[in-house]
């Protein structure tokens, strides 16, 4: 009896420790640069590093520019971007700007798009400054099912701050769904 | 056998609820505004409280300014800073400010600091103004190994609010590394 | 002895599940726009959705505009607030605004409120702009007893963004108090 | 490259007003705040003022205020110091001197122009 | 208004000397201080900022130190060119002000 109950400890520990680390996924994904697209509306964000510097994913998957949820359970998800300009890219096309993010959900079973947060700011980015630099920070705690699929949107994408340190967004387990 | 199985079930729940406890370690740093260091540039702020008011720590270290990580892991990261400046204090010398913050990571083993994120924004604080304020929020999931230490730079130190509520940063750890 | 294992490895699945539940309380709230007050001063948002699109909310309380703490731990705070203004809504009654949020926490043993967490701007909105948005994030981990209470205060609510995206507050709990 | 160039030497009588140039090239001096410094013979430096030529928007010492205006002209680059009711103890050498927005020093200075008040 | 004080208002070295000005507040300035040199033929130049900061193009030989109301600049060798009158500036508050300047002439 003494050693089968040293083998349910041992097995508990093991099932214990495996069954946590399954049951907490998670992303941090950075821009990747290279390829944002130009334009001063909106547009979905697409190109996001997941495997250098500071981006990692685990148990959830990034494709087409999209991060997609493989296990139901409630996440919290997390946006930081900055955007940027210095008098040496030339003029802004308007000094009036609306500096936003949107965190959407996209249900592949039901097709549909939905905004889950927002942030941003109208900003005055004057030519009598040589440089401008503003960051959204959007956060909460969402419901998501396996196969929903989490993007990111801006306006002005031309004016995102590159570094990994700057523009990135995220997500990370934190229980079941009852 | 039965006595057995209840002792398994009695250990268990202790070694469940003690092994939840010692695996998560957080932090709670709260702006200590006795000794808020100097220069307009970007500098380190070393003086944090971390055992009064909202402030808190377990299974984790504050030392020369910096929060030091006692337990590998994944950790979701934040920090709040806010700015304010009331025409009492006189004028300002310009009004123009970058007011920002990096949240850093130093590696001891490799002698390295990396700023993990990044915040802020360009403001123009006008005399027409009798107050101007501002706040900061950044926040993000990042794998952190024993040893290594969390800090936390702004420009414009002397601007910094230093209520509690105001000028903050925290970690708390969420899931062990595979 | 073996079916006295699997037994032990059955409840104790069971148990471990269960209780993981049981100890993670969260909510998150988004503004309930048919009832938002008026003025310019600080007040306190008594209106909140807490279950329909993203609001939920599971083993915390509602009541009173105040989100109630049923279980002690330590929680994730986090709130989203967005402002803005068009136009079309006639002038503003004056173009410098103080856009702040507090997340405020009362003990009904020890009548008291204090502020966990405020973030905020001073704005210009300019009449020479036919639209002007702003949005502030806060997020803070802290320590909460059962029977406190969670409230938000901001300013000008009458320039709220009524959108569940873009006007929200919430917690969850990470982990329990030593 | 930046360079600030300040009108001639002037001699002038007391109760006069004259005005100084500082003409910049090199950088948007909208993007700059001009400052005007003074430094009598054989003494230091005194900072008079500054403007800030995107706004028009200008500070003063208290000690210059009433005998100083700082002005700017963006479209020809240049910044204005006018001094009136003149008296011997305006005698000095004038520097103009700018700073970008975000930083408070003074990294490109003019030659100097020398006031000489006297009947 | 802030005062600026350099107690010593001339200073004599020898070249190669390691030379030190100091400059203090009337109150403190926290490290809002900017050191100028000023060549004899009227010249002014910009050698350091923020209390520490070298500006582009100044030889490494010049550097400052100091918080609070204390500052100093330090020339670690002193060559030829060096001979001029240092200025301490500080921008904690307008009105900017100036300290009355120290004169390093050579032995």
């Known amino acids: 009896i003494r050693a089968e109950k040293a083998m349910v400890d041992g097995s508990w520990l093991d099932l214990a420790k495996r069954s946590k680390l399954e049951a907490q996924p998670f992303a941090h994904l950075t821009i990747n640069a290279t390829n944002i697209p130009t334009g001063s509306h909106k547009v979905s964000l697409s190109s996001w590093y997941h495997d250098r510097g500071w981006a990692k994913i685990s148990n959830m998957t990034f494709s087409n520019g999209k991060l997609i949820v493989n296990q139901d359970g409630f996440y919290y998800l997390y946006a930081n971007i900055c955007f940027r300009h210095h008098e040496t890219s030339g003029d802004l096309a308007t000094e009036y700007l609306q500096l936003m993010v949107y965190v959407t959900k996209t249900s592949i079973k039901i097709p549909s798009s939905h905004t889950l947060m927002k942030g941003g700011s109208t900003k005055y980015w004057s030519g009598n400054s040589e440089f401008h630099f503003y960051s959204i920070n959007v956060g909460g705690f969402f419901k998501l099912r396996s196969g929903e699929e989490i993007s990111v949107e801006v306006s002005n994408p031309s004016l995102l701050d590159p570094d990994q340190d700057a523009t990135y967004f995220g997500a990370f387990k934190v229980r079941d769904i009852d | 056998i039965r006595a057995e199985k209840a002792m398994v079930d009695g250990s268990w729940l202790d070694l469940a609820k003690r092994s939840k406890l010692e695996a998560q370690p957080f932090a709670h740093l709260t702006i200590n505004a006795t000794n808020i260091p100097t220069g307009s540039h970007k500098v380190s702020l070393s003086s944090w409280y971390h055992d009064r008011g909202w402030a808190k720590i377990s299974n984790m270290t504050f030392s020369n300014g910096k929060l030091i990580v006692n337990q590998d892991g994944f950790y979701y990261l934040y920090a709040n800073i806010c700015f304010r400046h009331h025409e009492t204090s006189g004028d300002l010398a310009t009004e123009y400010l970058q007011l920002m913050v990096y949240v850093t990571k130093t590696s001891i083993k490799i002698p390295s600091s990396h700023t993990l994120m990044k915040g802020g924004s360009t403001k123009y604080w006008s005399g027409n103004s009798e107050f101007h304020f501002y706040s900061i929020n950044v926040g993000g999931f990042f794998k952190l190994r024993s040893g290594e230490e969390i800090s936390v730079e702004v420009s414009n130190p002397s601007l910094l609010d230093p209520d509690q509520d105001a000028t903050y940063f925290g970690a708390f750890k969420v899931r062990d590394i595979d | 002895i073996r079916a006295e294992k699997a037994m032990v490895d059955g409840s104790w699945l069971d148990l471990a599940k269960r209780s993981k539940l049981e100890a993670q309380p969260f909510a998150h709230l988004t503004i309930n726009a048919t009832n938002i007050p008026t003025g310019s001063h600080k007040v306190s948002l008594s209106s909140w959705y807490h279950d329909r699109g993203w609001a939920k909310i599971s083993n915390m309380t509602f009541s009173n505009g105040k989100l109630i703490v049923n279980q002690d731990g330590f929680y994730y705070l986090y709130a989203n607030i967005c402002f803005r203004h068009h136009e079309t809504s006639g002038d503003l009654a004056t173009e410098y605004l103080q856009l702040m949020v507090y997340v405020t926490k009362t003990s009904i043993k020890i009548p008291s409120s204090h502020t966990l967490m405020k973030g905020g701007s001073t704005k210009y909105w300019s009449g020479n702009s036919e639209f002007h948005f702003y949005s502030i994030n806060v997020g803070g981990f802290f320590k909460l007893r059962s029977g406190e209470e969670i409230s938000v205060e901001v300013s000008n609510p009458s320039l709220l963004d009524p959108d569940q995206d873009a006007t929200y507050f919430g917690a969850f709990k990470v982990r329990d108090i030593d | 490259e930046v360079q600030l160039q300040q009108s001639g030497a002037e001699l002038v009588k007391p109760g006069a007003s004259v005005k100084l140039s500082c003409t910049t090239s090199g950088f948007n001096i909208k993007a700059t705040y001009i400052h005007w410094v003074q430094q009598r013979p054989e003494q230091g430096l005194e900072w008079i003022g500054r403007i800030d030529p995107a706004n028009g928007n200008t500070k003063y010492d208290s000690k210059f205020q009433g005998k100083a205006t700082i002005t700017a002209d963006t479209s020809s680059n240049t910044a204005y110091l006018q001094l009136s009711s003149l008296t011997s103890e305006d005698t000095a050498v004038y520097f103009c001197?700018?700073?970008?927005?975000?930083?408070?020093?003074?990294?490109?200075w003019g030659q100097g122009t020398t006031l000489t008040v006297s009947s | 208004d802030i005062q600026m004080t350099q107690t010593t208002s001339s200073l004599s070295a020898s070249l190669g000397d390691r030379v030190t000005i100091s400059c203090s507040a009337s109150?403190?300035?926290?490290?809002?201080l900017n050191w100028y040199q000023q060549k004899p033929d009227g010249t002014v130049k910009l050698l350091i900022y923020?209390?520490?900061s070298l500006h582009s193009g100044v030889p490494s030989r010049f550097s400052g130190s100091g918080s609070g109301t204390d500052y100093s600049l330090t020339i670690s060798s002193l060559e030829p060119e060096d001979i001029a009158t240092y200025y301490c500036q500080q921008y904690s508050k307008l009105p900017l002000t100036f300290g009355a300047g120290t004169k390093l002439e050579l032995k």
């Open positions: 109150q403190g300035i926290s490290n809002y």
């Open positions: 001197a700018r700073s970008l927005h975000y930083y408070v020093f003074f990294d490109y």
């Open positions: 923020s209390t520490s």
